[in-house]
Interface confidence: low
């Protein structure tokens, strides 16, 4: 059973009065329709909820919100609804908070339809203050902050036009029209694409990219025949079009656009698509859709410069063009991604991969669980956990898996144990040691937090009916106290906390019913009195990351490096603090084969560390194009991964020599494009000739490196069909995460290409 | 409590190169940055560059690329600032000082707790 | 590089006086900006961090204020030890650089 309150547990002494003086209630005066709820800035206290209630009438909409504004933690609210003259905010923009500590906050406002341009209401007092602007332009997306400057606004209008602010929205100029998509870049550069005839849908595929690096003084255009772009750590992708027929490939840029190599991934038909599931500034994860309805593609993961692409996983599971995936980034451990896959019998596995892709395992079957009905072997099954996908068809799985960077190696999920996703009612489940172990934590779905980096979980109970009791646990979810926060249930609808996991601060956010009305209401707990004191150097221990056989000299080492961490100890009761910094010593670990991807022209044979040659490049000077430029390749068939920091050990022989030859791939850079030959004729005909005399040979090595529809078996195969039975393997990426960090609702924006 | 303890006075000759070291005490050694500061006799601060004791990075300012070198140890809890082709206006006091920790920035808060200094001068 | 320019560079006071430094970055540094105290003979002491935040231990007449280029520290009311040089430190972009000083002295 799972673990709760029995003789084992320790009870924390008097936490029912402790949490009774620090449970602080406050019921928002207004009808309950939506609500939502930001942080603003990091360790300020300062929360922002605005409440929505729409009444759609016959000729009109009748709608009204209020703004509240709390500095502590959510104990206390202020209505501040006067501060933005009771206008009503049109929440599909949300509200727009400023990157790091700026204390920023945009309100899109809902203005009547004959208005020449929006309103918007700004802050840059973490929301004491607010300034009324009346726009030149209609928005169509919210206000997108320059992650390097604050204030530094863009925005797309209705008109498709790009607008720049450079004093936070005070002053606002339309810099481009004809714009589909603008994202910012590095250095405070704007990425967007134009298109040049009728519109975004209609020129799909035909839209240049365009960058500025001076917000709109000067323009420069880096690729034509664009279907989409995207960014992800230090890579700029672009999809474009094929010249002969209707498939796009990938394209990628680590110079901003300047120049372009040909990403060696499988193209692309029109119903397909690309998605950049996660990238740092090592590599990329890249899901290749596969042709027809299937729901699944294929997961590659790339070199350092993102071109080069070794097959990481087959049927991976993700629905359609901006549909569901279960691509999960492990945050509390370097190296681990969880999703799951599509298996040839249409259910659906979870698998794991702790190396960064390199291998892919089933979860371990966790030691208190039995195997369920889906399992043929009811001796050996395998733990499988409940993302995205499961939230979208309505299962009842209230929450997806979390993970917080600075609670090492703790991951929660909900999942079942069997040989495929159940879509019986699931329970809670808690790795300790980054997803190779797993123990059931609490039966029945639940909501979820991550308090104090780690030294409290806080859980409640998913049900239709009105609850009043929440449980927490001071032990890594080992043991449970349950605390009734309130006599009155509420009709729960979300758990809050701060993002980054660090607060001691827990809302509970609901509603109460009664005849005729219903009013929102929240509950702030404060746990600061159950962790009584600071955490001192005995209440840590150290803890090696990715250890899985102790014997070995060698364990721990995850793309060439082992980290130790020091761990609070499950059975200290303290608090970290809002200071706490994860504590790691890393050491590094020799060289072996497992540190390297295949090379150009090479693959990994299935259950084989070494690569070996492709069959149909034996013999041939192996030649590639890159950023413009034929290069000649001396290897013997590795590359070292993307983030490998081994040292001695195998050390492969790599050469690449600069042919001093131009090549071109279909994405030609618009000068190029338009560039008229002025060279006699006679020139010309003589290097055809010349040309037609190698083109036998060049041609079979371009078909396969430089070009072309490419064969899946190009693709150093780390791992064709997941095994069920290898765990090893094992690190590490940092990726640029796609979540909205201080609001209230995970925001998932994966680039689709 | 907590502090850094720096290693005592040193003459120099031009051309030679002197090694500064800051032992911390207190704190997890590991978890806070170390930045490296100098001031010449009457003048103000010059900030050199820092170590990240975790991993061993380190950023220095452009004026001393390729003469500055910072190490640690954390078996010891120390770090060390090794100035190589010393001049005459490399006379200074020099500064170990931490980092001050907050969540994300860890250049963006100041510097908390400072060594008493160490008095370097370059003399022929 | 961004350059911090403090002033003034020298200002007399009495015990009891309000103070105000000043100190201009060369362009826009957020709010992160830091304040020193530096006594002869002695290491600097972090008085103010992220522009406006008092470092713990620092007494309550100290204060800071301003964002973007424009900053200033106040000490409502001069103490006898208070008579130093400040300085104040963007940490905004790298590399991190100091203003000039100013000296705080007796009237």
């Known amino acids: 059973s799972a673990p709760g309150e029995d003789e084992e547990c320790g009870r924390v002494r008097d936490f029912v009065a402790k949490l009774a003086n620090n449970t602080h209630q406050h019921v928002f005066d207004d009808l309950a329709g939506s609500v939502s709820l930001s942080w603003v800035g990091d360790s300020t206290g300062v929360i922002l909820v605005l409440t929505t209630f729409h009444v759609p009438l016959v000729i009109m909409t009748f709608g009204q919100s209020k703004l509240y504004r709390s500095e502590d933690y959510g104990k206390n609210f202020k209505d501040i609804t006067d501060l933005i003259n009771n206008t009503f905010i049109r929440t599909e923009f949300g509200m727009a908070i400023g990157p790091e500590n700026s204390g920023k906050v945009v309100l899109t406002a809902e203005v009547s339809g004959g208005s020449r341009g929006g309103r918007i209401f700004r802050s840059s007092d973490f929301a004491k203050n607010f300034v009324q602007t009346d726009l030149p332009f209609h928005p169509l997306t919210q206000m997108m902050y320059s992650p390097q400057n604050s204030d530094y606004l863009l925005a797309l209008s209705t008109e498709n036009g790009l607008w720049v602010s450079k004093n936070f929205g005070g002053k606002w100029e339309e810099i481009h029209k004809a714009v589909c998509l603008a994202k910012w870049g590095s250095d405070n550069t704007i990425f967007f694409t134009t298109y040049a005839n009728g519109s975004c849908k209609a020129d799909l595929g035909a839209l240049e990219l365009w960058r500025t690096s001076d917000l709109g003084k000067s323009f420069k255009t880096i690729g034509v025949k664009i279907y989409s772009f995207g960014l992800g750590g230090r890579f700029l992708f672009a999809s474009v079009m094929a010249d002969k027929d209707t498939t796009r490939r990938i394209h990628v840029s680590t110079d901003q656009g300047d120049t372009w190599s040909m990403a060696q991934l499988p193209s692309v038909g029109q119903e397909q698509f690309y998605s950049i599931l996660a990238a740092n500034d090592d590599m990329v994860f890249m899901h290749v859709d596969e042709p027809g309805d299937t729901g699944f593609g294929t997961i590659f993961t790339s070199d350092d410069r993102g071109i080069v692409y070794s097959k990481s996983l087959d049927r991976h599971l993700y629905t359609t063009t901006g549909g569901e995936t279960d691509f999960t980034n492990v945050t509390s451990l370097r190296g681990v991604y969880i999703t799951s896959v599509l298996s040839e019998d249409n259910s659906i596995q979870t698998m794991i991969t702790f190396d960064q892709g390199g291998r892919w395992t089933h979860l371990r079957k966790p030691e208190n669980s039995e195997c369920d009905a889906t399992a043929k072997n009811k001796n050996e099954c395998s733990l499988h956990i409940h993302a995205s996908y499961s939230i979208s068809q309505k299962l009842n799985v209230p929450m997806a898996p979390l993970s917080e960077p600075n609670a090492v190696g703790i991951v929660i999920a909900h999942g079942s144990v069997g040989d495929a996703i159940s879509v019986m009612v699931p329970d809670v489940y808690i790795s300790d040691d980054g997803g190779y172990s797993w123990t059931k934590m609490l039966e029945g779905p639940h909501y979820y937090t991550i308090l104090d980096s780690g030294g409290i979980i806080v859980a409640i109970e998913h049900s239709s009916r009105p609850i009043n009791v929440i449980k927490f646990s001071t032990d890594e979810g080992q043991c449970w106290q349950t605390y009734t926060f309130t006599r009155d249930p509420i009709y729960f609808t979300g758990l809050a906390s701060e993002p980054g996991a660090r607060s001691m601060n827990i809302s509970i956010w609901g509603f109460t019913e009664s005849f005729l009305t219903s009013q929102w209401v929240s509950y702030t707990i404060d746990f600061k009195d159950i962790l009584e004191r600071n955490c001192e150097e005995k209440d840590y221990t150290i803890w090696l990351a990715h250890s899985t056989d102790p014997e070995d000299y060698e364990d721990g080492c995850i793309l060439g490096y082992k980290e130790q961490f020091l761990r609070l100890r499950k059975s200290s009761v303290c608090q970290n603090g809002r200071d706490y910094v994860v504590t790691k010593q890393p050491s590094i670990c020799l060289c072996s084969l497992e540190d390297f991807l295949c090379d150009f022209g090479y693959y990994r044979p299935e259950n084989d560390s070494k690569c070996v040659e492709q069959p149909e490049l034996k013999g041939h000077d192996l030649e590639f194009c890159l950023y413009g430029r034929e290069e000649h390749l001396t290897t013997n068939g590795y590359r070292k991964i993307p983030g490998d920091k081994c040292q001695g050990g195998v050390n492969p022989v790599r050469e690449v020599k600069d042919l001093k030859k131009k090549c071109t791939s279909n994405f030609l850079s618009p000068e190029k494009q338009n560039s008229k030959s002025n060279s006699v004729p006679i020139i010309l005909a003589i290097v055809g000739l010349m040309l037609v005399t190698v083109v036998a040979g060049v041609l079979i090595v371009k078909k396969y490196v430089c070009g072309g529809r490419f064969l899946v078996h190009r693709y150093s195969v780390l791992q064709q069909h997941a095994e069920a039975n290898g765990v090893d393997g094992v690190d590490a990426l940092d990726t640029a995460s796609h979540t909205n960090k201080s609001g209230y609702h995970d925001d998932s924006d994966e680039d689709l290409l | 409590q907590v502090q850094l303890v720096q290693s005592g006075a040193e003459v120099k000759k031009p051309g030679a190169s002197v090694k500064v070291s800051c032992k911390a005490s207190?704190?997890?050694?590991?978890?806070?940055?170390m930045h490296w500061v100098r001031q010449a006799p009457g003048q103000g601060l010059e900030w050199m560059g820092w170590i990240n004791p975790n991993s061993g990075a380190t950023r220095y300012a452009q004026k001393f690329q390729g003469r500055v070198t910072m190490t640690r140890d954390t078996s010891i809890s120390t770090a060390y600032m090794e100035l190589s082709r010393l001049r005459s206006d490399d006379t200074a006091v020099y500064y170990c000082?931490?980092?001050?920790?907050?969540?994300?920035?860890?250049?963006?808060?100041?510097?908390?707790?400072w060594g008493q200094g160490t008095t370097v001068t370059v003399s022929s | 590089d961004i350059q911090m320019t403090q002033s003034p560079s020298s200002l007399s006071a009495s015990v009891g006086d309000r103070v105000t430094i000043t100190c201009r970055a060369s362009?826009?540094?957020?709010?992160?900006l830091n304040w020193y105290q530096q006594k002869p003979g002695k290491a600097p002491k972090l008085l103010i961090y992220a522009a406006s935040s008092l470092q713990s231990g620092v007494p309550s007449r100290f204060s800071g204020s301003g964002s973007g280029t424009d900053f200033t520290l106040t000490i409502s009311s001069l103490q006898p030890e208070d008579f130093a040089t400040y300085y104040c430190?963007?940490?905004?972009?790298?590399?991190?650089?100091f203003g000039g000083g100013t000296k705080v002295e007796i009237k």
């Open positions: 362009q826009s540094i957020s709010s992160y």
């Open positions: 430190q963007q940490s905004d972009v790298s590399p991190i650089t």
């Open positions: 000082a931490r980092g001050k920790r907050s969540s994300g920035w860890y250049e963006g808060y100041g510097m908390d707790v």
């Open positions: 207190g704190y997890t050694f590991v978890a806070y940055y």
